[in-house]
């Protein structure tokens, strides 16, 4: 368990032309607040997805009203730290998302209006218990300066807050004030206790009894804001004549520069010259380079052209954001025409077309039934932009490719026996019944109930087979004509069907990839 802490130092227009003068809209005054969102590991989720490690919201900052013709200042910020408690292990690598929100205080119907002013997203590596890490990030025309750290809460200790320190009954082999640490008996650890009175907000320590100050603060307990007034050039105790507080010890005492940086004094403060690969006030920030793999989702990392931009990510299709961390919903652009269904497969976009349309974006209208090949002598019927097949006897399904069993529905009434025939079906009626479906009872005197069967077609009539044979020949002739017609049409438009089948196959394969 532990706490992630974020300190916002400044938020304001970035350098260069075209910087915004005010965060507020023309509707009047506004105030700022911040939201921090933490995601564990090498998350590639969009910023909108849940903040699995936790999130926090700052208080509202002071009301800001733009001063006409005044230089755009750093904007008034909410007081205090943003703290995100975490229950489990600190992951070490995490995504840090900081959002700057604007609350408009003009006459809004239904209360204040909120809008997102800027969002920075960075993948970072950070050990718990380490010093404050500094960062400067640009979001559009805005610049955000902040520091952050992760600290364990006792009894948790270690860089991941996974080890528990607890007193043991055995005699301690550790030095005074230190406790044996479970589970490793030969390890003794305690979080550094800063110098008594060291500011919790503006100071930190890496060694017990130390008090190091964040940028903008000075003094032995980091209580003194660094001012540009001339009194800061003085050395010695507080100057009662000027009303300025001046720190006694020199700012480079104890070398506040980390990672091998060298310290040089400046009026009332100090300056670190950092070795290659480090930056920040005390060289405490390790410069993220392309070798760190800062681009999510396989994005291409390119070294930035200017010193402020350590790298630029060139994102794969379907991703955007400064670190390629946001998934683009490409289907929201409705690329599929004619009512096609859009499928964003991540690495590619596919359209599943409605019947009667084909092509990568369903742009081809398969008119005149051209693309709807009806098999086995079926005929294509158009209607309302859709196409359907009217199948020949004995066939069914969308394209008449399925052989239908005409006897499956038991069409012969009164116990008649059904025989499947290539032209349809034939019913052999039970004694006492007649008709195509054995639907008519035969009266004992040989006369059927209405409608009467014509002479020569009574049950058992020897001419019946001959008549059926004639009907069969006629049906064959008709079917043959239809088949010839369909084949010529099928050949003419076969390429469309092939393209559509290939497209469907590819889509199926990619969806299963």
């Amino acid at each position: 368990a532990g706490v992630f802490e974020l300190q916002i130092h400044s938020f304001g227009p970035g350098p260069g032309p075209g910087a915004p003068r005010s965060p507020c809209s023309a509707r009047g005054p506004c105030r700022l607040f911040f939201r921090v969102c933490l995601k564990p590991g090498l998350s590639e989720e969009a910023a909108e997805s849940p903040c699995a490690l936790g999130a926090a919201l700052s208080a509202r900052g002071p009301v800001y009203t733009e001063q006409p013709e005044a230089p755009a200042p750093d904007l008034p910020l909410p007081n205090g730290l943003l703290q995100v408690p975490f229950r489990d292990a600190w992951p070490g690598t995490f995504s840090l998302i900081i959002e700057t929100w604007r609350e408009e205080l003009g006459d809004q119907i239904g209360g204040p209006a909120w809008s997102l002013l800027a969002r920075v997203t960075r993948r970072r590596r950070l050990a718990a218990g380490g010093p404050w890490a500094r960062d400067i990030q640009r979001a559009g025309a805005w610049e955000l300066r902040f520091s952050y750290r992760a600290r364990c809460e006792l009894p948790a200790v270690g860089t991941a807050c996974t080890r528990l320190c607890r007193p043991r009954s055995a005699p301690s082999r550790c030095g005074p004030g230190l406790r044996p640490c479970a589970p490793l008996e030969d390890e003794c650890e305690a979080p550094p206790v800063c110098r008594a009175g060291c500011s919790l907000e503006h100071g930190f320590c890496e060694q017990p009894g130390e008090c190091r100050c964040l940028e903008g603060w000075t003094g032995p307990l980091c209580m003194v804001p660094v001012s540009t007034s001339s009194c800061l050039g003085l050395r010695g105790p507080s100057s009662t004549t000027t009303g300025c507080l001046v720190p006694g010890p020199g700012p480079c005492d104890g070398n506040p520069c980390a990672n091998g940086g060298s310290c040089s004094e400046t009026p009332g403060s100090f300056e670190c010259t950092c070795p290659r690969g480090f930056y920040g006030l005390r060289c405490e920030v390790s410069g993220v380079t392309c070798a760190d793999g800062p681009c999510f989702n396989g994005g291409l990392c390119v070294g930035g052209a200017d010193p402020d931009s350590a790298y630029i990510c060139h994102c794969p299709p379907g991703f955007q954001g400064s670190n390629c961390e946001k998934r683009v919903d490409r289907c929201s652009l409705q690329p599929c025409r004619n009512g096609g269904l859009c499928l964003d497969l991540g690495h590619a976009l596919r359209c599943r077309c409605r019947a009667g349309f084909a092509g990568p974006r369903c742009e081809h209208d398969l008119d005149d039934c051209a693309g709807r090949a009806c098999a086995n002598g079926g005929t294509c019927v158009e209607g309302g932009g859709a196409h359907r097949c009217s199948c020949a006897l004995g066939f069914g399904g969308r394209n008449c490719r399925e052989r239908a069993d005409p006897c499956a529905a038991r069409p012969c009434a009164h116990g008649g026996r059904c025989y499947a025939h290539f032209s349809g079906l034939v019913c052999a009626c039970a004694p006492g019944y007649m008709g195509a479906r054995c639907e008519f009872p035969v009266h004992p005197d040989g006369v059927s109930a209405l409608p009467a069967a014509p002479p020569g077609l009574r049950p058992g009539d020897p001419q019946r087979a001959g008549v059926i044979a004639v009907i069969v020949v006629v049906v064959i002739a008709i079917v043959a004509g239809i088949v010839v017609l369909v084949i010529s049409r099928k050949k003419r438009m076969a390429k469309y069907e092939k393209a559509e089948i290939k497209e469907m196959g590819e889509m199926h394969r990619e969806l299963n990839a």
Epitope: G41, L42, E44, A291, D292, G293, G298, G299, L300, P317
Partner: antibody
């Protein structure tokens, strides 16, 4: 300096197996997608397969020509990616390169695989 | 898969010449095209990404252009170290596919 070093190539009979390794240095390996790309003698480049990150559950993707025969794995603790090649065919003869990312930005020097009876 | 057709397959040029290599995609690939340089016995090196952006450390004489289906790599003034084989690759649709290569030889 970023370095990718492939090893494990050699001569193998058709139907045989081979395991290639690619050791990375100079990069935070666990943050990079890794690919294998091959080049048959005197021919162009052909993407073989890819393995993504732990956060992607080490998802793998393969070219149709090797699907079911080749397997890519990675060991982030060792900064190494592997290509296990089974049921090798003569047409698998090539120089095999490991590369990073979606756009193949860093490349190894390659290792030669010869499949011949 | 998207096919990338590169032309010419080889060309002869002299130091100082302006050289143009073209690549045609079988379907629209936006600007998701990269160019690679490969010298004999060496691994390919990324030159251009996003159709027209030079990768880190690539000399300014190399430039790329195009979008959709037609792409061009231009070497404004050929240098002795530029004699190599050049490949285009599309990254719009998975899997990535490459052109057949263009060998630039000394005239």
């Amino acid at each position: 300096e970023v370095q990718l070093v492939e090893s494990g190539g050699g001569l193998v009979k058709p139907g045989g197996s081979l395991r290639l390794s690619c050791a990375a240095s100079g990069i935070t390996f666990s943050n990079f997608w890794m690919n294998w790309v091959r080049q048959a003698p005197g021919k162009g480049l052909e993407w073989v397969g890819q393995i993504r990150l732990k956060s992607d559950d080490y998802a793998t993707h393969y070219a149709e020509s090797v699907k079911g025969r080749f397997t890519i794995s990675r060991e982030d603790s060792k900064n190494t990616v592997y290509l296990q090649m089974n049921s090798l065919k003569t047409e698998d003869t090539a120089v095999y390169y490991c590369t990073t990312g979606y756009y193949f930005d860093y490349w190894g020097q390659g290792t030669t695989v010869t499949v011949s009876s | 898969n998207i096919q990338m057709t590169q032309s010419p397959s080889s060309l002869s040029a002299s130091v100082g010449d302006r050289v143009t290599i073209t690549c045609k995609a079988s379907e629209n690939v936006g600007t998701y095209v990269s160019w690679y340089q490969q010298k004999p016995g060496k691994s390919p090196k990324l030159l251009i990404y996003g159709a027209s952006n030079r990768y880190t450390g690539v000399p300014s004489r190399f430039s790329g252009s195009g979008s959709g289906t037609d792409f061009t790599l231009t070497i404004s003034s050929l240098q002795p170290e530029d004699f190599a084989t050049y490949y285009c690759g599309q990254f719009y649709s998975f899997p990535s596919t490459f052109g057949g290569g263009t060998k630039v030889e000394i005239k």
